[in-house]
Every structure is written in C-alpha cells, then in structure tokens.
C-alpha cells in the first residue's frame, strides 16, 4: 500500500507523459488522477515506467475499478498486463479479439503464464466456442495451445477452425485429444483431393480409426514412419501386411528400425510370419506358419 500524501505544488499530472517516469512512488500516487490514467492508458505503454511505478499505476486502476477493468482500459494495458493476477483477470469481460491480441503480444516469447491462461479462458467462455479467428490467434502465439485443452473443451472447436491448425500445433497432443480432433479435421478437409487431403490430415491421424487407415492405404500416400508411429495401436493392429506396405510405400523399410516399439511391435505380433517375410526386412516375432489365429474378441461378440 502506498501512503496517502498531498501532491507537491506544481506536480499535479495534467496528462500521462514522460515526465512521470521521474516521479517517486508516493508522487505518482498523489499526483496522478486515476480517471486521467484510465482515459490515457494508451500512453502508458509508450512510457518506460519502472516496475515499482507500474505497481502504483495498477493500484490506482484497482481502486477506480474494484469490480474489474472495462475493456477500453484492458485493451491498452500493454506491459501493465504482466502485473495482473489471475484473480484480477477473472473480473474482466474481454470480447474483442483485438484486445486479446494486444495482451498476448505483451507476453510474446514467454511461457503461457497463469494470467494468460485465465485471459484465454475468459475470452473463449465469453465467445461460447473456439472459432477460427480465435484459434488462429492463439496458436500463432502459443503453438501448443490446442493440446493444453481437455477433450471436452476441444469438442467445442468447430470443424471450420481446423483450417487454422498447423502440424506443430499438435506436437504435444495425446491420443485422447486427437480422437476428438480427427473427425473434425476429416470433415473440414473432406472436399480436398487425395494428395492434398493427406497433407492436411496427416497431423491428425493419431486419432484415425482402422477403416480410415485402410482407405488411405489404397491412395498411394507414402506415410512417413514418424506419422505411422503416432497412430493408435488399436487402429494399426487389424491392418494387414499388404495394407501397411501400401500405406508406407517406400518408407516401409523404416519398420525394421522400429520393430521393438509400439505400435510396430504389437502389429508384428499379430501378423503371420510368412506375410512379414514378404517385406524382406527381416522382421521377426510374427505368428509361426501353421498356427491358427482365433480372434477372441470376435467370438465374444458373436456369442
């Protein structure tokens, strides 16, 4: 708390300008009117206030707006945003994408702080869904943003927003998240032709079911091993050797290097050794010739 002291003669601020950077904390408190500060917030970010001075300015705004700042002030907070707590931000009602962009710009290059996470949460909840423009903005500033959302939150992402997603935005997504995103991506890209479709859908394939992988294997897509290794194990297991060969194309040779890792390891265990041998890669661990394979899950389903 800054003590209440009278403003020295001639020091009363008539506008927010560079002369204020030389005011001591108590002078700022005493000589800067909170209403003046609020109407001239756009100037604050253009003046190099010290960290302590910014604390005083924040205190003045808090006193003026105990229920939360109006958007006209929030929009121009600039570096003062970094002084806000999540509790402060929960009082805000941010509706403008421009306001969101302005505040994210201030935090650019930093990790996503609790303040930013709260700001985004307030903004998205206010909008009701994660629309394309918002998603575009958020992933531009925080490539990992999408993967920080729960599957429930991701379900509110409209398929049209998927166009904004870049491959690196999905790097940290887990299978549960991709399960939600994949059907949306499939819907979003459904009108594209084969090769273009594959380029777009590739990053989402960690959520693809077996039947879609089988369909892709008929389209000469030449999936790389990195993508294959991210596929759902349960989706890969039913694929035949011929289907995997078609799916991977020239990349099929990479299976040898990955034969001890999932999903390749588990897939090998489900294939006939005879079939694996046709690949000529020396993959071992398949079902020996002459053995009968019983699909117990199918049997249970029939009974």
């Amino acid at each position: 708390e800054v003590e209440k002291t009278a403003c020295p003669s001639g020091k009363k601020a008539r506008e927010i300008d560079e002369s204020l950077i030389f005011y001591k904390k108590w002078e700022l408190e005493a000589c800067v009117d909170a209403a003046l500060l609020a109407t001239q917030m756009d100037r604050v970010n253009a003046i190099p206030f010290t960290y302590e001075q910014l604390d005083v300015l924040k205190h003045k705004l808090d006193e003026l707006y105990p229920q939360g700042y109006p958007e006209s002030v929030i929009q121009h907070l600039g570096y003062l945003f970094l002084k806000m707590s999540p509790e402060d931000i929960r009082k805000w009602n941010v509706t403008s994408l421009e306001t969101l962009k302005a505040l994210l710009e201030v935090n650019k290059g930093h990790e996503m702080s609790p303040q930013v996470a709260t700001l985004i949460d307030r903004f998205v909840k206010g909008r009701g869904q994660l629309d394309k423009d918002t998603l575009d903005t958020l992933t531009a500033f925080y490539p990992g943003y999408l993967c920080s959302l729960s599957p429930e939150e991701l379900s509110s992402v409209p398929p049209s927003s998927i166009w904004a997603v870049r491959p690196q935005d999905l790097d940290t997504c887990d299978p549960r998240q991709l399960d939600v995103l994949y059907p949306k991506a499939r819907l979003a890209f459904q009108n594209m032709n084969g090769s273009e479709y594959f380029v777009k859908i590739q990053s989402f394939l960690g959520g693809a079911p077996t039947e879609d992988l089988k369909a892709l294997s008929q389209q000469n897509v030449s999936m790389d091993l990195a993508t294959f290794m991210k596929l759902r194990t349960d989706a890969v297991l039913p694929l035949t050797v011929a289907e995997v060969q078609k799916l991977l194309g020239p990349h099929v040779e990479g299976l040898k290097a990955e034969e001890r890792h999932r999903p390749v390891r588990d897939w090998i265990l489900r294939q006939r050794q005879d079939d694996l041998d046709t690949l000529g890669l020396g993959l071992q661990g398949g079902i020996p010739n002459g053995y009968l394979v019983l699909d117990l899950s199918m049997q249970e389903a029939l009974s």
């Epitope: 002369s19 030389f22 970010n45 190099p48 010290t50 960290y51 570096y79 290059g109």
Partner: antibody, heavy 121, light 109 residues
Framework: QVQLVQSGGGVVQPGRSLRLSCAAS????????MHWVRQAPGKGLEWVAV????????YYADSVKGRFTISRDNSKNTLYLQMNSLRAEDTAVYYC??????????????WGQGTLVTVSS | EIVLTQSPATLSLSPGERAILSCRAS???????LGWYQQKPGQAPRLLIY???TRATGIPDRFSGSGSGTDFTLTINRLEPEDFAVYYC??????????FGQGTRLEIK
C-alpha cells in the same frame, strides 16, 4: 551531429571534490534526460545518476548517494556531476550519456568520450 | 535487485564465425527494458540493440538480439575484424534504476 564533450577529470586526493562537465550540441538538450555512467579500470560499466530533462528530478546509485550531485544548465546545454567526499573506489572513467526514451525502450543512444577521475593520496 | 549475468566471460572466435552471447537476469524482466552495447578499448560504449531485439540506427544486420523473461541472447553472424570488443547487456526499470552485466569479451582466436 550529436556531440557530448566531457571535461573536468583529473587526479584528486581522497575526501576532496571534483566537478565534471558534459557540453552537448547537435540536439535539443532540454528535451532529453541525461545520465552519468562510470567504469573502473579494467572493470564493467556502472550506472551513477540520472537527471530529468528539466532538472527537477534526480536519481542516484546507492554507492554515490549523498556524495554526488547531478545537475544541468539548459541555457548552456551542459550537464554536471559534482563529486564530493571522493574515495579510492570512485576511481574510474566517467561517461555522460543521452537517454533515448521516446520509443518507450530506454537506451543510451549517445555517449561522451569519457573523462578519467583518479582518487589517490 | 535484478542482477544480469553474462556468459561466457570470454569468447574466442575467428572472423567469419558466429558469436552467441548470453545474458541471464536473476528474475523475469520486460523485453523492452533490455539492451546491448559494444565497447572497444579506449572508446565509449555504443548502443547496438534496444527492446531486446531492435537494432539501433546504423547497426549492421549481422547483429541480432532475442530472448524474453530471464534469458537473452546477442548473436553476431559472420564476425568482422571490427566486431572484436567487449559486449554488455543492460536493464532498466528496477532498483538500481539501471544495471549492466559484467560483460563478455569477444577476442580473435
């Protein structure tokens, strides 16, 4: 072009005083805050003091507070540093520097040539 | 008090190589309050970078600044003979008002 020409350095005994000057030209001196920065022999840079464009506000590093006084005469386009009660640890090259704050990213965009102050008995 | 720690203390490289100089702050600082200076023997410092990444007037584009929070970097691509000097990072806004790193000496290998 912008120029900051310094004078007033020299050898002085501990406890004595010295006044440094920095004559500015090539810009509107009265529109800029000015600083003094020093550098002990073979050492790094150390900020000393700042004065606002109109001379009404001053800040000092703790190491010189109460002993050094920064001032300016805008009619003469000159910055001063009055150094009293000098100590051996004040031995350094002293630089005056113009402070560019208009971009909100404060930086010293022009420096004087430096003047050596040696405090020795 | 915000302390700036520069590393390495000395960097030995040849002309044409790339120099990467680090400046670490003891606590998170605003990017717009972080600058870099070059000082050659017997000369005053010269402003290179302000706002962590903005080149000052007349500074060649082989100099670039980056970073945020506590970690900042000055990169000099394709070193020229005149680039061998001492480099200081500087921060404004704390107490004391202005602090400098201890400097990195860039010398010819």
């Amino acid at each position: 072009q912008v120029q900051l020409v310094q004078s007033g350095g020299g050898v002085v005994q501990p406890g004595r005083s010295l006044r440094l000057s920095c004559a500015a030209s090539g810009f509107t001196f009265s529109s800029y805050a000015m600083h003094w920065v020093r550098q002990a022999p073979g050492k790094g840079l150390e900020w000393v003091a700042v004065i606002s464009y109109d001379g009404s506000n001053k800040y000092y590093a703790d190491s010189v507070k109460g002993r050094f006084t920064i001032s300016r005469d805008n009619s003469k386009n000159t910055l001063y540093l009055q150094m009293n009660s000098l100590r051996a640890e004040d031995t350094a090259v002293y630089y005056c520097a113009r402070w560019k704050v208009s971009s909100s990213s404060p930086a010293f965009d022009y420096w004087g040539q430096g003047t050596l102050v040696t405090v020795s008995s | 008090e915000i302390v700036l720690t520069q590393s390495p203390a000395t960097l030995s490289l040849s002309p044409g190589e790339r120099a990467i100089l680090s400046c670490r702050a003891s606590q998170s600082v605003y990017t717009k309050y972080l600058g870099w200076y070059q000082q050659k023997p017997g000369q005053a410092p010269r402003l290179l970078i302000y706002d962590a990444s903005t080149r000052a007037t007349g500074i060649p584009d082989r100099f670039s600044g980056s970073g945020s929070g506590t970690d900042f970097t000055l990169t000099i691509n394709r070193l020229e003979p005149e680039d061998f000097a001492v480099y200081y990072c500087q921060h404004y806004g704390g107490s004391p008002l202005i602090t400098f790193g201890q400097g990195t000496r860039l010398e010819i290998k």
